[in-house]
Every structure is written in C-alpha cells, then in structure tokens.
C-alpha cells in the first residue's frame, strides 16, 4: 500500500472576515518536501499555484497567497492541495472568506481568525504525467 500523504491545512491572516479593500493572506501548510502548493477557489477549475514554498518548522512547509485589496468577488470557499513528487495530496477542508463593507481603515481589527484542515477534491487535469504537477492556469481561471 502506498504511504499516505498528510492532508494540508489552510488558514487566513488576519482572519476570515475581511473589510472591503483590506488585504488577506491564505496560508497553506503541508509536510516538508512539498514542491507546489495550490490554492483552489470553490471548485478545482479556479486556482493559483506557487512553488514559493518555505519551511515553517522542521516537519512542516508552507506557502502564502496574498490578496492585496479584497473585493466582494473574492468572497467564497477556499482550500489547499499540494504536490509532493510524485503525488498530489488530498485537499484541505474549505475555509470561507467573508467580505464586508469597510467600517474602519485597512488595518481595522474587526476580523475573525480562521483555519481548517481536511479533505476534498483534486488538481486540474492539466498533466497526465504522474511526476509533474499540472502547469498553472492551463485550464484554470486565476483566483486574483
């Protein structure tokens, strides 16, 4: 039997309730050795990939996906998946981003922290090469 890959986790900084125009960063975490992290929105067809992976701890790697100015259209469900050669992981649970009318400045503290970890779907079917991740955007809309 193949060795299981641990599920990724997803969190949002500074939280999951973000004022319009403020920034948010999604943080995807997985084991060491991850080559590519993918942040998916709602379904597999809308995603962003990054190979800018850093080591968060001796046993964990992470990638960060930043939206500089959140719009209403950024609200929705997000999840992470990673590629650790030669396999894609299962996906994290969904994290819901809520966008609200700005009541203060961009650094207004009225956000709620949020994180999630668990299952879901798959990467886009961009590559049938089991030893390479699907190339970004070939069949996908970009998140932002």
């Amino acid at each position: 039997q193949e060795e299981d890959l641990p599920r990724p986790s997803i969190s949002a900084e500074p939280g999951t309730v973000i004022p319009l125009g403020s920034h948010v960063t999604f943080v995807c975490r997985g084991p060491v050795g991850v080559q590519t992290f993918r942040l998916e929105r709602d379904s597999r067809s809308t995603y962003n990939d990054t190979e800018d992976v850093s080591q968060a701890s001796p046993s964990e790697s992470e990638a960060r996906f930043r939206i500089d100015s959140v719009r209403e259209g950024n609200a929705g469900l997000y999840r992470c998946i990673y590629y650790k050669p030669p396999k894609w992981s299962e996906q994290s649970d969904y994290l819901e981003l809520l966008v609200k009318e700005s009541s203060g400045g961009p650094d207004s503290p009225d956000t709620e922290p949020g994180s999630s970890a668990g299952p879901t779907q798959r990467p886009s079917d961009n590559s049938h090469n089991e030893h390479a991740p699907a190339s970004q955007g070939l069949k996908a809309e970009h998140l932002y």
Epitope: K87, E90, G118, P119, R122, D125, E130
Partner: antibody, heavy 121, light 111 residues
Framework: EQSLEESGGDLVKPGASLTLACTAS?????????MCWVRQAPGKGLEWIGC???????IYYASWAKGRFTISKTSSTMVTLQMSSLTAADTATYFC??????????????WGPGTLVTISS | ELVMTQTPASVSEAVGGTVTIKCQAS??????LAWYQQKPGQRPKLLIY???SLASGVSSRFRGSRSGTEYTLTITDLECDDAATYYC?????????????FGGGTEVEIK
C-alpha cells in the same frame, strides 16, 4: 469519454474470497480522485464500502467493512476490492464510483454499471 | 460512527405535486451531502452536491437545502419520470470522521 467498468463478479461458495476490479478510462488517476466501492443487495439500498484517493493512497472504509474488505490501486487505471470470508449477506451488485471532476465536496459523479456477486452453496 | 437517517421510506404523490425527502446526519457534516436518483436496474445518478448545488443537466425542479444536520431534497412539479428511489450520502472522507454513509433510500411513486 470517461467511464468505469467493474469486473470479477461471480457465484462463489460461503467462506470463499473474491477480488473485483474497476477499470477506468478517459481520465488519469494521477489527478487525485476518490475511487469508491458501493454495493446494493437485491431489492435493498446503497451501502458504502470505502474509497481510495488515487494519488495520495489514503483509504477510508466503512466500519463494518474493515478487515474483510481491502481496497487497492493496482495500476494507473485500476482499483480492486478484495473480499474474504464471504457470506450470503454479501450477495449484491458491486458498483465502482468516482468523485466529481468539476464539483466540490466529493460527490460520486461517475458510476460503473455494476458487477453481480452471488454467495451460495 | 456516522449514520444517515432518511425519511420517509416511501412516498406516493400525483403528477404536478411536490415531494419532500429528509436526511438526518448523526453529526455535523458541513454540507458534505449529495443526493442521487436510482431507477431499477440502473446505476445511481448524481442530482445534488454540496447540500444544495444542482449537478449539470439536472432539472431545477430538484432542490436541496440544509438546516443544521438535517438535509432536505424537494422535488416540485412532479413528472412520471421522477418515479425512482432517492438516496442521500455524506461525502466527507477524512480524519475528523469517516463519511461515505448512505441514507436508507426513499422510493417515490407517481400516482
């Protein structure tokens, strides 16, 4: 066109073992699908047996199926269901199903036609 | 262990009527709920995923909704072709709990 085809259904005696195969075409296991086995006894409802994630290798079983049923990925296009110590209660049509390519939350969107397993002496 | 309790076991309704089928999850399953239609001798067909999202090609007469751990499939403006057995399924496979369980099914007869 994407499809699934089960094979290996047979008439076997109580206590015997049997292995069913599910062959996929039109898509790649490397893209990470949940490949599931579901059974349906004659005139009864659907019963989930378990699933394997085709890329990561993670396997999930119904509690009643653990120990007697084993799901494996045997190639880039085939998953199998090994069944042991079979009894008359295991008589059913066995379906292979795959979760969705375009929807979230893992619904079984693609189903095979099923293969009939009959346990009788 | 997750249990999906589906009610009623059977229902009979006239053409043009409305049928409501409920599925109660024994614990929170966070919208990981699908509804299927199955006709005798056929494989199941996906109708609803994520509790309330309609699968492609499925009539908008089928509607899914959620209230806490209770999930509902409503079929309006019934047609003869809707005669079938309907199943709910938890579609979460993970570490929190093992999903996959189906409800017992609801046989819909069209009068």
């Amino acid at each position: 066109e994407q499809s699934l085809e089960e094979s290996g259904g047979d008439l076997v005696k109580p206590g015997a073992s049997l292995t069913l195969a599910c062959t996929a075409s039109g898509f790649s296991f490397s893209d990470g699908y949940y490949m599931c086995w579901v059974r349906q006894a004659p005139g009864k409802g659907l019963e989930w047996i378990g699933c394997i994630h085709s890329s990561s290798g993670s396997i999930y079983y119904a509690s009643w199926a653990k120990g007697r049923f084993t799901i494996s990925k045997t190639s880039s296009t085939m998953v199998t269901l090994q069944m042991s110590s079979l009894t008359a209660a295991d008589t059913a049509t066995y379906f292979c199903a795959r979760d969705s390519e375009s929807y979230g939350y893992n619904p079984c969107e693609l189903w095979g036609p099923g293969t009939l397993v009959t346990i009788s002496s | 262990e997750l249990v999906m309790t589906q009610t009623p076991a059977s229902v009979s309704e006239a053409v043009g009527g409305t049928v409501t089928i409920k599925c109660q999850a024994s614990q929170t399953i966070s919208n990981y709920l699908a509804w299927y239609q199955q006709k005798p001798g056929q494989r199941p067909k996906l109708l609803i995923y994520a509790a309330s999202s309609l699968a492609s090609g499925v009539s908008s007469r089928f509607r899914g909704s959620r209230s806490g751990t209770e999930y509902t499939l409503t079929i309006t403006d019934l047609e003869c072709d809707d005669a079938a057995t309907y199943y709910c399924q938890c579609t979460y496979y993970g570490t929190t709990y093992i999903g996959g369980a189906f409800g017992g099914g609801t046989e819909v007869e069209i009068k």
